[in-house]
């Protein structure tokens, strides 16, 4: 595979990594779909210093990041822990809340006006950010 | 200029298999995502596959999941359909189209000729 | 899957008609929506994305209006060259999905 060395046109770099903010909403399966159609992946948020980063970014509006625990327990879409990982949740979230009447709980996790955490209906069409690492090989399947 | 050309169309039983090619030229070829759209005769277009520009992440239309297989070689600047278990249904012209892009991918702005394929015993 | 319905399904015109074809998605798609329009034998070409926006190269005769759920491809001033099968195609989720085309032919 190829390696990225720099960031794609419209992408913004920050410690190796690079990031794409919306500028319109989707729901979270649409989202990561776009990230993936990227070759990249809903932001996974591992400090304190990417969280101010992105919350600068995105400023106070609702923003899909890379959470969901749509199986289950809480993961990130790439595969980083989120037991031993940073989280930066809104007092008592996530709720799992059922009261919004549209049916099921809350399974995916957004930033919020001030920047921390909550849990919502995946359905519902937020703004999202991309990331993709930079160096990291591009992982090109075998052709058949 | 931006072109596309597809090939590897033609006649093939029901059950069997046939490999779609679509070369590329005048574009940065791994930054640009792309997809198959088809066409049965005298119908509307279906879109088929995307992948990804560096070909990590594929999206099909669930009538072809499991049969179809979209891949890329960027080294050689061409994208393929790989299309197994083929149907009766599965007879259209294949057209290979680039994703257009400005801040968002946007729609399918480059489009080749078609290549037809026939499934037919 | 995003059910995609043009209406009409045809239409008859004559040279310097304005003509109006309508698209409804079956759920919200903002505006992640294109136009294509397509002449016997040949491929597809993206005339409107992002449902208002013009394709670099396509006349300015040609315009997209419309957010959410209803859209609409207008043509100002129908040219000779504009007859032919226009599709509207959302690009808001997988697995992208196209109406079912209208028709433009010559009254």
């Known amino acids: 595979g190829s390696e990225r060395t720099c960031c794609p046109v419209n992408w913004v770099e920050h410690e190796r990594s690079c990031y794409w903010f919306s500028r319109s909403g989707k729901a979270w399966a649409d989202a990561d779909n776009y990230c993936r159609l990227e070759d990249a992946h809903l932001v996974v948020v591992t400090s304190w210093e990417e969280q101010k980063f992105v919350q600068h970014h995105i400023g106070p509006v609702n923003t899909w990041m890379g959470l969901h625990d749509q199986n289950g327990p809480w993961k990130w879409v790439d595969g980083t822990d989120y037991e031993t990982g940073f989280k930066n949740w809104r007092p008592e979230q996530p709720d799992d809340w059922y009261g919004h009447g549209l049916g099921g709980g809350e399974d995916c996790a957004h930033f919020t006006d001030d920047g921390r955490w909550n849990d919502d209906v995946c359905q519902r069409p937020y703004r999202w950010v991309c990331e993709t690492e930079l160096d990291k090989a591009s992982q090109e399947p075998p052709l058949l | 200029e931006v072109q596309v050309l597809e090939s590897g169309g033609g006649l093939v039983q029901p059950g069997g298999s046939l490999r779609l090619s679509c070369a590329a030229s005048?574009?940065?070829?791994?930054?640009?995502?792309m997809s198959w759209v088809r066409q049965a005769p005298g119908k509307g277009l279906e879109w088929v596959s995307a992948?990804?520009?560096?070909?990590?992440?594929?999206f099909y239309t669930d009538s072809v999941k499991g049969r179809f297989t979209i891949s890329r070689d960027n080294s050689k600047n061409t994208l393929y359909l790989q299309m197994n278990s083929l149907r009766a249904e599965d007879t259209a012209v294949y057209y290979c189209?680039?994703?257009?892009?400005?801040?968002?991918?946007?729609?399918?702005?480059?489009w080749g000729q078609g290549t037809t394929v026939t499934v037919s015993s | 899957d995003i059910q995609m319905t043009q209406s009409p399904s045809s239409v008859s015109a004559s040279v310097g008609d304005r003509v109006t074809i309508t698209c409804r998605a079956s759920?919200?798609?903002?505006?992640?929506l294109a136009w294509y329009q397509q002449k016997p034998g040949k491929a597809p070409k993206l005339l409107i994305y992002?449902?208002?926006s013009l394709q670099s190269g396509v006349p300015s005769r040609f315009s997209g209006s419309g957010s959410g759920t209803d859209f609409t491809l207008t043509i100002s001033s129908l040219q000779p060259e504009d007859f032919a099968t226009y599709y509207c195609?959302?690009?808001?989720?997988?697995?992208?999905?196209f109406g079912q085309g209208t028709k433009v032919e010559i009254k």
């Open positions: 759920q919200g798609i903002s505006t992640w």
């Open positions: 189209a680039k994703l257009g892009k400005d801040y968002y991918y946007y729609g399918m702005d480059v």
């Open positions: 005048g574009l940065t070829f791994s930054s640009s995502a």
């Open positions: 992002d449902a208002s």
């Open positions: 195609q959302q690009a808001n989720s997988f697995p992208w999905t």
């Open positions: 992948i990804s520009g560096r070909g990590g992440n594929t």
